[in-house]
């Protein structure tokens, strides 16, 4: 009863096609697979940037697997190959582990890679990053930005660089077609005549670096003598209202200070009658049904209501009505006293509760 | 309360999935493989049919209850085949990223049913 | 607590309507898929109707046709519009939320009697 | 359609008895290696109540005396020891096949 085994996959590598850190792993079958044409079989394969503390881990019966990575690490990866149960009459068989590595050789020394990379999608339409030049690199030093997405044939340079200085600081880039919600890639690599410049990696999603417009056209309506509705509409642009947060901030007669988060392009706000002023600015970022993360907006142009407006608006919309319907009252009353008291009191609400 | 938008069920299976993500402290169903699907067509069926295999973990239960709201019926072979490709697992945790991300695009997009 | 409350049973002739409405409080309801199932006096259970939360509905040949389900999220109602309806339809109606093909039918509410006679 | 077959139609056991009802389906009701068939429990005047999904997973709540198993066309419901408020009509159901079709009931009664 001899024991069954199995060889590792042959030719196991990883493959960098120049797409700034998606890379591919591939792999060849065993040899010596003749005893088991009937059998599909599969491989584990496990594989991490090093110095992470934890492995990613797939089974596939292909020969291949693509994923992203950090190209500013190594990436070590090991495979062997399983031969389920259903082969085997028995347990699953598998073999020893193949491994393979890959890293850039890494230019220049790490302070000469660029500095506080920051990237912006404004308004989910423009994308613009920015960095500054590595520690003590000289002037005649130049950066230049690839990037890189699923949809993309090839990595494309930036052709629109910020500059300061004659050094590149920032790109702004193209309308992106069909580049968020997939991992985008970019490389911001250096040339000098003097000394070699380290590449920077990085990757990012573009829906979760997003900063909106701030909401515009902010509004007051009095619902009621104790109520205040406060609006503003979304600004222009590709981001449906589904996708927002909002942050208000509130001051009444420059002292109370409000804030809220709310869902919705309206805030309910209780006031008081000696109410005189009421001023409020809202800011706006993308919520968690549509991206991971987010930035707020700037805050809006501030919007105020004089307490003369409120006055007025006050009289308008509730005290006539209400000054009616007491003389109203009073008049029945009036009428009522007459007769035999049989009727219950009824006290007008001249005060809001707060 | 006023109509209830057809986002409503899509926000709920987000709110969840965000939450299992955030919550995670060991690995998710302590590291089970799932096959992974093509997230297009009939794509609530095919997350069910590869989730259902785990078991013993109540973490993606209510996942796995919710999606059967978009699913509730088998379905027949014929009509899709997001599933019918099972050549790769994934772990767990790797899919309810993919899953969540997939969702959030529907949702983005306006694509709630 | 989920609970799931049916209405609107009753008696009706042959060939008429009616129209049973349920309830649900205690859980999400536009995020399940719910049912419609009944039982003949001293029989065993027929499963007569289903709606996913995006409202695909599925039916049994016997009832395909003649009855409706249909969901009102805002309510958090679900309905069962019974139209030609035959001696053979008199049941207990229950409402129930179904956790898919994979759990069942998870609640069941009280049910409501339909007697279709003449 | 796809019958489900309930055996026996009626039973009488004691307090404390092993009980145990099976149910047969025409066709087999396994998708992907799980068994689409569950169990409910029904008193008189009462709605059903779930008892297991999938041929063995007890829904929440459910006492750990009930158990379900089998694959394919044959399966069992058991009440390891059967308790007063277990005297009641037992139903299976598969949902692998459209109709969804539920067996004729076992109704447990007190001997």
């Known amino acids: 009863d001899t024991e069954i085994k199995v060889n590792p996959p042959q030719d196991f590598e990883i493959v960098d096609p120049g797409y700034l850190g998606y890379l591919y792993l591939q792999w060849q079958p065993p040899l010596s697979l003749d005893h088991f044409k009937e059998c599909t079989v599969e491989y584990e394969l496990k594989y991490r940037n090093i110095g992470s503390e934890t492995w990613k881990t797939i089974i596939t019966k292909n020969l291949h697997y693509k994923d992203g990575f950090d190209l500013n690490k190594g990436i070590e990866a090991k495979i062997h190959t399983l031969l389920p149960w259903q082969c085997t009459n028995g347990s699953e068989v598998q073999s020893s582990w193949a491994e393979t590595t890959y890293w850039i050789s890494p230019q220049g020394i790490p302070e000469t890679k660029v500095q506080d990379m920051d990237c912006v999608y404004y308004n989910w339409q423009y994308l613009l990053c920015s960095w500054k030049p590595g520690i003590g690199v000289l002037l005649d030093t130049n950066y230049n930005l690839f990037y890189w997405y699923e949809g993309l044939d090839h990595a494309l340079q930036c052709v629109d660089y910020i500059k300061a200085d004659g050094q590149n600081i920032g790109c702004r880039f193209p309308y992106l077609e069909a580049s968020d919600y997939k991992d985008f890639y970019i490389c911001v690599n250096g040339s000098s005549e003097n000394k070699p410049i380290r590449s920077s990696y990085f990757t990012f999603q573009l829906q979760n670096i997003v900063k909106p417009l701030p909401p515009v056209y902010l509004t007051f309506t009095r619902e009621s003598s104790c109520e205040i509705k406060l609006k503003w509409s979304i600004p222009l642009g590709p981001i449906p209202a589904r996708c927002f947060d909002y942050e208000i901030e509130i001051r009444e007669d420059d002292t109370t200070l409000v804030t809220a988060t709310v869902e919705n392009e309206t805030y309910t706000l209780k006031t008081t009658n000696e109410t005189r002023q009421l001023c409020f600015v809202v800011r706006s970022k993308v919520n968690i049904y549509c991206s991971d993360d987010g930035i707020w907006s700037e805050w809006s142009d501030k919007q105020c209501w004089e307490g003369e407006d409120l006055s007025k608006k006050t009289l308008l919309r509730f005290w006539l009505p209400f000054g009616f319907i007491l003389i109203l009252v009073i008049f029945v009353t009036g009428l009522l006293l007459r007769k035999p008291n049989t009727y219950p009191k009824m006290i007008p609400e001249f005060f809001c509760d707060t | 309360p006023g109509p209830v938008p057809p986002s409503t069920a899509l926000r709920e299976l987000i709110e969840e999935l965000v939450n299992i993500t955030q919550n995670q402290k060991a690995p998710l169903c302590n590291g089970s493989m799932v096959w992974s699907i093509n997230l297009t067509a009939g794509m609530y069926c095919a997350a069910l049919e590869s989730l259902i295999n785990v078991s013993g973990c109540s973490a993606i239960e209510k996942t796995q209850r919710m999606l059967s709201g978009f699913c509730p019926h088998k379905v027949s072979a014929g009509q899709f085949s997001s599933l019918h490709v099972r050549d790769t697992k994934i772990e767990v945790a790797q899919f309810v990223k993919d899953l969540l991300l997939h969702l959030k695009k529907l949702f983005r997009e306006g694509r709630f049913n | 607590e989920v609970q799931l409350v049916e209405s609107g049973g009753g008696l009706v002739q042959p060939g008429g309507s009616l129209r049973l409405s349920c309830a649900a409080s205690g859980f999400t309801f536009i995020s399940y898929a719910m049912s419609w199932v009944r039982q003949a006096p001293g029989k065993g259970l027929e499963w007569v109707a289903s709606i996913s939360s995006g409202g695909n509905t599925y039916y049994p040949d016997s009832v395909k046709g003649r009855f409706t389900i249909s969901r009102d999220n805002a309510k958090n109602s679900l309905y069962l519009q019974m139209n030609s309806l035959r001696a053979e339809d008199t049941a207990v109606y229950y409402c129930?939320?179904?956790?898919?093909?994979?759990?069942?039918?998870?609640?069941w509410g009280q049910g409501t009697l339909v007697t279709v006679s003449s | 359609d796809i019958q489900m077959t309930q055996s026996p139609s009626s039973l009488s056991a004691s307090v404390g008895d092993r009980v145990t009802i099976t149910c047969k389906a025409s066709?087999?009701?396994?998708?992907?290696?799980?068994?689409?068939m569950h169990w409910y429990q029904q008193k008189p005047g009462k709605a059903p109540k779930l008892l297991i999904y999938r041929a063995s997973n007890l829904e929440s709540g459910v006492p750990s005396r009930f158990s379900g198993s089998g694959s394919g066309t044959d399966f069992t419901l058991t009440i390891s020891s059967l308790q007063p408020e277990d005297f009641a009509t037992y139903y299976c159901q598969q949902s692998n096949e459209d109709p969804w079709t539920f067996g004729g009931g076992t109704k447990v009664e007190i001997k």
């Open positions: 129930a939320r179904l956790d898919g093909y994979y759990f069942g039918f998870a609640y």
């Open positions: 066709e087999s009701v396994d998708n992907y290696g799980k068994s689409l």
